[in-house]
């Protein structure tokens, strides 16, 4: 349905606020160094121009797409070539070109101070002070920092920030009430960046075809009673809005994702038993739930697969006929049949079955040559299920700090040439699995395990992309999305690396440690432990495990000095000598 | 008792529609395909369809376009729809239960009564 | 595909061996998808042979299949007052849509 006016017709849809919002969201995310205050400025321009084209959207410019609009718009920053570089380039590029090289200079890793918290009365005042204000700046802050954060979701974590302000500004004890909820919606918030960005990645680097086949089977295993026609329409249409947002159509999103919902709940009955209640919120909460909603019951008495898919001579018929409608049944009935899967291996089960198809096809004989695929499946499936396994006992054994530890060890021998700070941060992440999964029965640990790795994996590859340094990094994340995680559990220790200089101030430590929280002091001592396996990658378990219980000692014992600096320079090198004879460096 | 009991049938003007209803009873559909045959008065049997359990629809040439075979397995029915009728169209139908799951083995082990369609003005 | 059945009537009597032939115009799927079924007026159909030659349930042994690929044979080894009928074979062929039934074959008391 095309209209005179695009800019009129989403800021009549989403109502002047959600437009602010979103803008601010889209321009954040676009320049991540430009202040708060240039923003703010640009959104209001656009504000004001939007409102001109709903009171006549024959009014001058009304009719130039969204992205000559915006584009426009970001291109009038005075300090673009001095703050960006040659982002400032794109300025020269019509669209859609020129939008197409902004979303290519998105920075994953931006260099940008680390947020920090002030004092609960600081933020209480400003709340108070100016609410709109406050609650766009959060709104900034996320999005410069998160360039791929599904906007109308970062709307509800405003609301939700906004809600915990006007709740616990009044409370008694403002902290109490306080900083659980921020803790909760920054580590959320963490999580939910990490999952937007993806189904991005997926999107852009693999093609929509991935993105289908990804939403084809999570949505099979979410609504196992809907029928295969539905399930695709569902899939056409979170498809549209998960290009729109990583494409940066930011309001176009938001709009079609509110359709999307309203869809869902005008249909839940041939949807799905479990939309209930998330049909009855607002909006917002509303696509949250239902983007959350747990995996209705499967129908009783479920034909067998085989029939259709193995048994039936009319196989490479259907296939030849169809072939990704074909594929696309073969993975929602599995799928549907199986929410014990996680989705990759659904995907990689679905591979195996198109494999095996396009040979047996051109078969003399097609039936005797994929009668046998189910059996190529076991396999398939019983690695996560072993791997999953061992790591979740692994997990019971030494707790989750340790746990991290044994990754970091693990991942750092695999790639060593990627940075510290990532391999610290990419192997933390991997060693909250056992925290969040470990807890599951059988039936839900391998779709909360591979799933939540393969997100972690993405941040790897994302954050590798932007400056490579390890072509077996490059080569599992860009060969095979579904097989990432395999391709990384499947790296040994990389032989070809040259083991780093031994440097004595990456391992000299400051009074400054015994501040810092317990989650900072083991960003501390895990980066230590990174650097020591790249200075000797040949190191044993039990080498690494003495030094670091040395240098947990040694953090111990300082802090409680009286003369803590004194402390860590004469117990350092101490320290520092010992580990090297420790591990004969 | 397992049956399958056909229903839907009658008169109808040359141009019109019919939906036709194959209710089993004693079994789970969701176990084996499901197809219709019609037999046109004094005269031979003639395959109209089939649908798999999983949903997939094969169908005569002649048929193809004007019939459609569905199922709705919480039913426990199998559904012909016919449109554009013909006074050709004529017929007792069926509804046959294949041996096998997937495609269409030509061994209907389960019939229906069938139920009698005229199609005249 | 064409289902041609021989002879489209026959009479014979109780207790006499009885043969009906059917062929395709191109083979049945895996050589053996063909079935024999058995109608009686006011009934639907009912069937007594598939795959060729694997005898349903509940069906007499005096009934028997054989044949491959277009070929095929019913046999009634001895004729019973209840075999009088018509018999229809069908076949299956490599799709599920152009499956077929034959003509059709009368058997009526001598």
């Known amino acids: 349905d095309a209209h005179k006016s695009e800019v009129a017709h989403r800021f009549k849809d989403l109502g002047e606020e959600n437009f602010k919002a979103l803008v601010l969201i889209a321009f954040a995310q676009y320049l991540q160094q430009c202040p708060f205050e240039d923003h703010v400025k640009l959104v209001n321009e656009v504000t004001e121009f939007a409102k001109t084209c709903v009171a006549d959207e024959s009014a001058e410019n009304c009719d130039k797409s969204l992205h000559t609009l915006f584009g426009d718009k970001l291109c009038t920053v005075a300090t673009l070539r001095e703050t960006y570089g040659e982002m400032a380039d794109c300025c020269a590029k019509q669209e859609p070109e020129r939008n197409e090289c902004f979303l290519q200079h998105k920075d994953d890793n931006p260099n940008l101070p680390r947020l920090v918290r002030p004092e609960v009365d600081v933020m209480c005042t400003a709340f108070h002070d100016n609410e709109e204000t406050f609650l766009k700046k959060y709104l900034y802050e996320i999005a410069r920092r998160h360039p791929y954060f599904y906007a109308p979701e970062l709307l509800f974590f405003a609301k939700r920030y906004k809600a915990a302000f006007t709740e616990c500004c009044q409370a008694a004890d403002k902290a109490a009430c306080l900083l659980p909820k921020l803790d909760e919606l920054r580590d959320e918030g963490k999580a939910s960046s990490a999952k937007q960005r993806l189904k991005c990645a997926s999107l852009q680097k693999f093609g929509e075809r991935a993105f289908k086949a990804w939403a084809v089977a999570r949505l099979s295993q979410r609504f196992p009673k809907a029928e295969f026609a539905e399930v695709s329409k569902l899939v056409t249409d979170l498809t549209k809005v998960h290009t729109e947002c990583c494409h940066g159509d930011l309001l176009e999103c938001a709009d079609d994702r509110a359709d999307l919902a309203k869809y869902i709940c005008e249909n839940q009955d041939s949807i799905s038993s479990k939309l209930k209640e998330c049909c009855e919120k607002p909006l917002l909460e509303k696509s949250h739930c239902i983007a959350e909603v747990e995996n209705d019951e499967m129908p009783a008495d479920l034909p067998s697969l085989a029939a259709d898919f193995v048994e039936s001579k009319d196989v490479c018929k259907n296939y030849a006929e169809a072939k990704d409608v074909f594929l696309g049944m073969f993975l929602y009935e599995y799928a549907r049949r199986h929410p014990d899967y996680s989705v990759v291996l659904l995907l990689r089960l679905a591979k195996t079955y198109e494999t095996t198809l396009e040979k047996c096809c051109a078969a003399a004989d097609p039936h005797e040559c994929y009668a046998k695929v189910f059996d190529e499946f076991k396999p398939l499936v019983e690695e996560p299920q072993n791997l999953i396994k061992q790591n979740c006992e692994l997990f019971e054994q030494l707790g989750e700090y340790k746990f991290q530890n044994a990754l970091l060890v693990r991942y750092t021998k695999k790639v060593p040439q990627v940075s510290t700070p990532t391999l610290v941060e990419v192997s933390r992440n991997l060693g909250k699995v056992g925290s969040k999964c470990c807890k599951h029965p059988e039936a839900k640990r391998m779709p909360c395990a591979e799933d939540y790795l393969s997100v972690v994996l993405n941040q790897l590859c994302v954050l590798h992309e932007k400056t490579p340094v390890s072509d077996r990094v490059t080569k599992c994340c860009t060969e095979s999305l579904v097989n990432r995680r395999p391709c990384f559990s499947a790296l040994e220790v990389d032989e070809t690396y040259v083991p780093k200089e031994f440097n004595a101030e990456t391992f000299t430590f400051h009074a400054d440690i015994c501040t810092l929280s317990e989650k900072e002091r083991q960003i501390k001592k895990q980066t230590a432990l990174v650097e020591l396996v790249k200075h000797k990658p040949k190191a044993t378990k039990e080498q690494l495990k003495a030094v670091m219980d040395d240098f947990a000692a040694f953090v111990e014992k300082c802090c409680k000095a009286d003369d803590k600096e004194t402390c860590f320079a004469e117990e350092g090198k101490k320290l520092v000598a010992a580990s090297q004879a420790a591990l004969g460096l | 008792e397992v049956q399958l009991v056909e229903s839907g049938g009658g008169r109808v003007q040359p141009g019109g529609s019919l939906r036709l209803s194959c209710a089993a009873s004693g079994f789970s559909l969701s176990s084996n395909a499901m197809g219709w045959v019609r037999q046109a008065p004094g005269k031979g049997l003639e395959y109209i369809g089939i649908?798999?359990?999983?949903?997939?629809?094969y169908y005569a040439s002649w048929a193809k376009g004007r019939f459609t075979i569905s199922r709705d397995n919480s039913k426990n029915t199998v559904y012909l729809q016919m449109n554009s009728l013909r006074a050709e169209d004529t017929a007792t139908y069926f509804c046959?239960?294949?041996?096998?799951?997937?495609?269409?083995?030509?061994?209907?082990?389960?019939w229906g009564q069938g139920t009698q369609v005229t199609v005249s003005s | 595909i064409q289902m041609t059945q021989s002879p489209s009537s026959l009479s014979a009597s109780v207790g006499d061996r009885v043969t009906i032939t059917c062929q395709s115009s191109?083979?049945?799927?895996?050589?053996?998808?063909l079935s024999w079924y058995q109608q009686k007026p006011g009934q639907p159909p009912k069937l007594l042979i598939y795959?060729?030659?694997d005898l349903a349930s509940g069906v007499p042994s005096r009934f028997s299949g054989s044949g491959s690929g277009t070929d095929f044979t019913l046999t009634i080894s001895s004729l019973q007052p209840e075999d009088f009928a018509t018999y229809y074979c069908a076949g299956g062929f490599s799709s599920s849509s152009d499956t077929a039934f034959g003509g059709g074959t009368k058997l009526t008391v001598l």
């Open positions: 191109e083979s049945v799927y895996s050589n053996n998808q």
């Open positions: 649908i798999s359990v999983g949903g997939f629809t």
């Open positions: 795959d060729a030659s």
């Open positions: 046959a239960r294949d041996r096998h799951g997937g495609d269409s083995s030509g061994a209907f082990y389960l």
